[in-house]
C-alpha cells in the first residue's frame, strides 16, 4: 500500500495520479504512463519516472545534453520497459525493433542491435560521478562547508544513506559528488544511488519531481550555489560492451 499523505497526493512524486480507492478508502498513488502503484514515502524509481515523463505532453520533453564520454547518458529520453518492481529491464527496445542493453540507471551499455540481442542480467551501476560547474561567485566556497551541505542534501531531500556519498571534491568552479553503492551494500529500504542522482539532476535543472515543494535552493553558508553545467558519469560493476568503432570515435 502506498504511504501517501492524508490529502491524497504523493509528496515524493508529482508525476502520479492519486485517489482514495485503496482499502478502507485510503489514498493510492499510481505513476503516470505505467499506472504502477508507487511508494510515496521514498523516491520513485528512475524507470517509472522516465516512463511518466514520456507520457507527458511532447513539449515537456528535453533531451539530456550529449557528451563524448563513455556511459554518459548520450541517448536522451526514451520510453523504457520497467519490471514489476519499477526497475529497468535489462533489454530495452524501441518501436522499430532496435534493441540495446542498459544498466540499473537505464543508460545504454552496449551497441544497438535487433530483437535477437540478449541482455542476460541487469548490470548494476555501483559508482556515479556527478560533475557540476557552479556560476562565478565572489570567492570560492569553503570546501568543508560545501561538502557538509551536499551530504545533508542527499540525506534529507533524497533520503540517501550518508555512507553512499563517498566523496565531495571541489576545485573552483568544479564540484564532483561521488556516489558508491555495491549490490552487497544495498539493504532493503535503501534508496538507490541511481534514483537519488536522477532526482538531483532534475532538481538542478529546475524540474523538481517533489510535490508542492519549492525548487532546490542550494546555499552554502547563506551563499547561493547556482549550477550552470551538469555531467553525470556512470560506472557499472561489469564494464560496458561497445564496439571499437564507438570507443575510438
Amino acid at each position: 500500500h502506498t504511504a501517501a499523505q492524508d490529502n491524497c497526493t504523493c509528496p515524493t512524486n508529482k508525476m502520479t495520479v492519486c485517489s482514495p480507492d485503496g482499502p478502507g478508502g485510503r489514498c493510492q498513488c499510481r505513476a503516470l504512463g505505467s499506472g504502477m502503484a508507487v511508494d510515496c514515502s521514498t523516491l520513485t524509481s528512475k524507470c517509472l519516472l522516465l516512463k511518466a515523463r514520456m507520457s507527458a505532453p511532447k513539449n515537456a520533453r528535453t533531451l539530456v545534453r550529449p557528451s563524448e564520454h563513455a556511459l554518459v547518458d548520450n541517448d536522451g529520453l526514451y520510453d523504457p520497459d520497467c519490471d514489476p518492481e519499477g526497475r529497468f529491464k535489462a533489454r530495452q527496445c524501441n518501436q522499430t525493433s532496435v534493441c540495446w542493453c542498459v544498466n540499473s540507471v537505464g543508460v545504454r551499455r552496449t551497441d544497438k542491435g535487433d530483437l535477437s540481442l540478449r541482455c542476460d542480467e541487469l548490470v548494476r551501476t555501483h559508482h556515479i560521478l556527478i560533475d557540476l560547474r557552479h556560476r562565478p561567485t565572489a570567492g570560492a566556497f569553503n570546501h568543508s562547508d560545501l561538502d557538509a551541505e551536499l551530504r545533508r542534501l542527499f540525506r534529507e531531500r533524497y533520503r540517501l544513506h550518508p555512507k553512499f556519498v563517498a566523496a565531495v571534491h571541489y576545485e573552483q568552479p568544479t564540484i564532483q559528488i561521488e556516489l558508491r553503492q555495491n549490490t552487497s551494500q544495498k539493504a532493503a529500504g535503501d534508496v538507490d544511488i541511481g534514483d537519488a542522482a536522477y532526482y538531483f539532476e532534475r532538481d538542478i535543472k529546475g524540474e523538481s519531481l517533489f510535490q508542492g515543494r519549492g525548487g532546490l535552493d542550494l546555499r552554502v553558508r547563506g551563499e547561493p550555489l547556482q549550477v550552470e553545467r551538469t555531467l553525470i558519469y556512470y560506472l557499472d560493476e561489469i564494464p560496458p560492451k561497445f564496439s571499437m568503432k564507438r570507443l575510438t570515435a
Epitope: 500500500h1 504511504a3 499523505q5
Partner: antibody, heavy 123, light 112 residues
C-alpha cells in the same frame, strides 16, 4: 526475505497494560501499512487496527479504540501495540501482519504475518 | 460494520475431494472505483495464518493452482481441487473495502 518478529508470550496482571512489539526486516518498513489481529482461544480472527509507518496515521476498529494504541519506531523498523486496562477477555494471541505488496496489487491483503504473541491476563 | 458470513462452519473431506467454501457480506465489497478487497487465508494449528488469494481470485506467490477464487459484490467462493493433507485447517475470508475490516467466522476443513 520479509520477517515480522514477535515475542512468544506475555503474562500480565488484570488492570495493567502491555506493549507488544513487532520487528520488521527484509523490506522498506515505511512503505507498507501494518495491521494487528486478535485471536481468542478457540475463536476466529478479529481486526484491531492499522498503522502507516511512514507518518504514524492509524485507523482502529471502534471496538478496540479505547483499548489499543498503535505506534511505530521507524529507526528500528518496529511496530508496537499497547493494550490497556487488561481483563481476561484480552487473553489472546495477537498477530502483527503486513498489508500487501506495492507492485503486485495485493493491497488490503495480509501477505506476511508474525508468529503471534500469546497474552495471558491472570492475577 | 460489514458482517461477513462463511459457510459451512465445518467441512469434512477425503483426500482428493473438491470443495467450495462460501463467503457472503452484508454489503457490497466493491468500492466506487471498482476495487474489491476480498482475500482468503488458511490457518493451520500452531502456525500463523497464511495468505492464499487476494482481490477475489489472485493467487499469492507459492500458492498451488488447486486454489481458486470467484465472486463479486456480496457473494464469494473459494474452491479447492484435489484436497491434500497440507490443506487441512481453518479457512477465513477477509474484507478490507470498508472500515473496520472484518473476517468471516471461519470454515474448518477436516478429514472425514
Amino acid at each position: 526475505q520479509v520477517q515480522l518478529q514477535q515475542p512468544g508470550a506475555e503474562l500480565v496482571k488484570p488492570g495493567s497494560s502491555v506493549k507488544l512489539s513487532c520487528k520488521a526486516s527484509g523490506y522498506t518498513f515505511t512503505s507498507y501499512w501494518m495491521y494487528w489481529v486478535k485471536q481468542r482461544p478457540g475463536q476466529g480472527l478479529e481486526w484491531i487496527g492499522e498503522i502507516n509507518p511512514s507518518n504514524g496515521r492509524t485507523n482502529y476498529n471502534e471496538k478496540f479504540k479505547s483499548k489499543a494504541t498503535l505506534t511505530v519506531d521507524k529507526s528500528s523498523s518496529t511496530a508496537y501495540m499497547q493494550f490497556s486496562s487488561l481483563t481476561s477477555e484480552d487473553s489472546a494471541v495477537y498477530y502483527c501482519t503486513r498489508e500487501g505488496h506495492n507492485y503486485d496489487g495485493s493491497l488490503g491483503a495480509m501477505d506476511h504475518w508474525g508468529q503471534g504473541t500469546s497474552v495471558t491476563v491472570s492475577s | 460494520d460489514v458482517v461477513v458470513t462463511q459457510t459451512p462452519l465445518s467441512l469434512p473431506v477425503s483426500f482428493g475431494d473438491q470443495v467450495s467454501i462460501s463467503c457472503r457480506s452484508s454489503q457490497s465489497l466493491t468500492n466506487s472505483y471498482g476495487n474489491t478487497f476480498l482475500s482468503w487465508y488458511l490457518h493451520k494449528p500452531g502456525q500463523s495464518p497464511q495468505l492464499l488469494l487476494y482481490g477475489i481470485s489472485n493467487r499469492f506467490s507459492g500458492v498451488p493452482d488447486r486454489f481458486s477464487g470467484s465472486g463479486s459484490g456480496t457473494d464469494f467462493t473459494l474452491k479447492i481441487n484435489t484436497i491434500k493433507p497440507e490443506d487441512l485447517g481453518m479457512y477465513y475470508c477477509f474484507q478490507s473495502t470498508h472500515q473496520p475490516y472484518t473476517f468471516g467466522g471461519g470454515t474448518k476443513l477436516e478429514i472425514k
